[in-house]
Every structure is written in structure tokens, then in C-alpha cells.
């Protein structure tokens, strides 16, 4: 069975949008008007993972690109990256753990926890135009809350 996916955009709780910054990085910045077309569209796939009553495992691919957000250790630190995959094999229901995020909904906001590194979250900085990264703190300076906007296929 093909994995169930939906197309969406994400904005952090300060309404910053996510855009490509070079071939393998995302950054967060405020966009308006026609510039909104720059924001990345994700293909969010519902995959197998350590699902709970309040966590839904998903993979976040870039729509019509063979790139997925993944979590790996770099210099002993959990790190967010965009990883290139074989489009013939992805997306799939049984994604490798590094590609899986636990989507957590709290007060109409979403958090994306790394399945590979529990308590590490997709994060943005308060500052404009900074990379999207994997952060190990919630409720601090960095932003871990997002809203999702559905995009029609």
C-alpha cells in the first residue's frame, strides 16, 4: 500500500516561514506577499514509528524533491540535515529511524521530536534568516512550536 502523505507548509510560532538556503539547508524568515511562494512545501508521510496516544510518527520530505529531513550525529551532536534518497524507494511506510519525527499537537501548535534523538526538536532561532536546526531544549529562546498549512496537491 502506498504510504499516506499530505502536502503542507510549516511556520514557526513567530510566523516565520521555511525556505531553502542552498541545496541542503532550510532557513526561517518572515515572508509576505509574493515572497510566500518561496516557502518550501513538505510532503508529510505517515509512517511506522513509536506511536503513542499523543505522538504521530511522520517523515518530512520536500515535495517533488528526493530530499528528507533526517537526524544524525555530527561531531557527537544530534543534527538536522536534508538527506538525498533514491526516489524509487521513498517515501515508504517503514522509514529508517533517522527520518522519523514524532508529531506532537499541543494547544493547536505542533512540535516535531526526533525519533532517533528523543527530546530533540526541529527548531528555529528568534533571529531572522537563520538555519532550521535540531534543538535539545523546549521553552527556551529557540522556537520549537509550528503551525501547519495544508496545500492542495
Amino acid at each position: 500500500a502506498p504510504v499516506r502523505s499530505l502536502n503542507c507548509t510549516l511556520r514557526d510560532s513567530q510566523q516565520k516561514s521555511l525556505v531553502m538556503s542552498g541545496p541542503y539547508e532550510l532557513k526561517a524568515l518572515h515572508l509576505q506577499g509574493q515572497d510566500m511562494e518561496q516557502q518550501v512545501v513538505f510532503s508529510m508521510s505517515f509512517v511506522q514509528g513509536e506511536e503513542s496516544n499523543d505522538k504521530i510518527p511522520v517523515a518530512l520530505g520536500l515535495k517533488e524533491k528526493n530530499l528528507y529531513l533526517s537526524c544524525v550525529l555530527k561531531d557527537d551532536k544530534p543534527t538536522l540535515q536534508l538527506e538525498s534518497v533514491d526516489p524509487k524507494n521513498y517515501p515508504k511506510k517503514k522509514m529508517e529511524k533517522r527520518f522519523v519525527f514524532n508529531k506532537i499537537e499541543i494547544n493547536n501548535k505542533l512540535e516535531f521530536e526526533s525519533a532517533q534523538f528523543p527530546n530533540w526538536y526541529i527548531s528555529t532561532s528568534q533571529a531572522e534568516n537563520m538555519p532550521v536546526f535540531l534543538g535539545g531544549t523546549k521553552g527556551g529562546q529557540d522556537i520549537t512550536d509550528f503551525t501547519m498549512q495544508f496545500v492542495s496537491s
Epitope: 511506522q48 513509536e50 505522538k55
Partner: antibody, heavy 122, light 107 residues
């Protein structure tokens, strides 16, 4: 060798809370999930819910409001609590280890305890 | 939730017979189906995972096949110790759901 052993009172009064413990050996509870399954006398198997290695839980909808699954990794024990029991909760209760093989076979249950019969009666 | 339809619910057979049990799921589950054997007073034992993968130590007379929504479990030549109840389980998504069981009895 992987082993799971359920324990707890065999008789619980209606409206009280059923409490069971699953003690495991041969694997670490921080690495593998554990499910609870029950089987009423002469009937089929019903999956109750599970607790993952990281401590997150998934409860099957029919029992969700009455169910608590928790664990103590250091004691290698998983506990099940089911509140407000009725005669319909009379069953053999099993705990089972999840395979936890990411990107291959995450949700299967490969090793089971021998089960413990719980009777709900006054 | 995924609904499971297992048939037959009971089956009488003789030693040496070939026996087939089927399991149908309400949704496509790829190959995420397991088969368990349960003897009276004992815990279920996993025989086959992922539709066709024989677990270590399980005799080769047991086999499984199928994908999507239709699955088959076969015992090629029944042995006296095979008389038991057999259950299918979908391991595609939570909540996990079992078939109703097939009781295999001596004819």
C-alpha cells in the same frame, strides 16, 4: 534468554482497580516496547496497549479511559492498572515484548509471558 | 482500526493432512501479518512474521503467504503436536488487532 513473567492478584472486586506487574529479563526495557494482551476464558485475544522504550504509551480506545501502563526500567518491570473493573474484565492477562526492528518489523510481538488469570468477582 | 476476518473458526483434520487457514484484513497492510499458535493453558507462540518469515526453530511444515488484504497459513502435513488454536495479528499499525482464531481439532 528473553523471559517475561506476569504477577498480581488473581481476584479483584467489581469497581476496584486491577494491578498487574510484568517482570522481564534478557532485554532492556529502555530498548524495547512491551504490550499487554488479554484473553477472556474460552475467547480470543484482545490487544490492550503498550509502553515504548522511551516511556510513551498507546492505549487501545475501548479501555483508554480506565487504563494506565507504566514501567520502572531499573527494576525491569512494567505495570498495568485497569480501574473500575467489571466481570467483563475477567481474563488471562499477558505481557509481550515488541520486536522494535525499525524500518523492518516494529510492531510485532515476539516473546510472551505465560499469562495470569484475573477474575473479577465479589 | 483494522478489522480482521479469520476463517474457518474451527477445523477438524487428521495427522498427515494439509491444512489451510485464511485471514482477511479490512485495509491493505502490505506484509505486516503474523501467525501465532496457542495451546490450552499456554501463551501464544509466534510462528510466522511478516506474512511468510518462519521464526527460528519453527518446523518447515508451517508456512505463510499473502500481502495486501489476503493471507494464508498452511501446515503441509499435520503432526499430533499441531492441534491447537491459531491466530493472525496485523502489525501494520496501532492498535494491533487479532483474528478471531481457528481451533484445529483431531478428526
Amino acid at each position: 534468554e528473553v523471559q517475561l513473567q506476569e504477577s498480581g492478584p488473581g481476584l479483584v472486586k467489581p469497581s476496584e482497580t486491577l494491578s498487574l506487574t510484568c517482570t522481564v529479563s534478557g532485554f532492556s526495557l529502555s530498548d524495547f516496547g512491551v504490550s499487554w494482551i488479554r484473553q477472556p476464558p474460552g475467547k480470543g485475544l484482545e490487544w490492550i496497549g503498550l509502553i515504548w522504550g522511551g516511556g510513551d504509551t498507546y492505549y487501545n480506545s475501548p479501555l483508554k479511559s480506565r487504563l494506565t501502563i507504566s514501567k520502572d526500567n531499573s527494576k525491569s518491570q512494567v505495570s498495568l492498572k485497569l480501574s473500575s473493573v467489571t466481570a467483563a474484565d475477567t481474563a488471562v492477562y499477558y505481557c509481550a515484548k515488541q520486536t522494535n526492528l525499525w524500518a523492518y518489523d516494529l510492531y510485532s510481538m515476539d516473546y510472551w509471558g505465560q499469562g495470569t488469570l484475573v477474575t473479577v468477582s465479589s | 482500526d483494522i478489522q480482521m476476518t479469520q476463517s474457518p473458526s474451527s477445523l477438524s483434520a487428521s495427522v498427515g493432512d494439509r491444512v489451510t487457514i485464511t485471514c482477511q484484513t479490512s485495509q491493505d497492510i502490505d506484509e505486516d501479518l503474523n501467525w501465532y499458535q496457542q495451546k490450552p493453558g499456554k501463551a501464544p507462540k509466534l510462528l510466522i512474521s511478516l506474512a511468510s518469515n518462519l521464526r527460528p526453530g519453527v518446523p518447515s511444515r508451517f508456512s505463510g503467504s499473502g500481502s495486501g488484504t489476503d493471507f494464508t497459513f498452511t501446515i503441509s502435513s499435520l503432526q499430533p503436536e499441531d492441534f491447537a488454536t491459531y491466530y493472525c495479528l496485523q502489525s501494520d499499525r496501532l492498535p494491533l488487532t487479532f483474528g478471531q482464531g481457528t481451533k484445529l481439532e483431531i478428526k
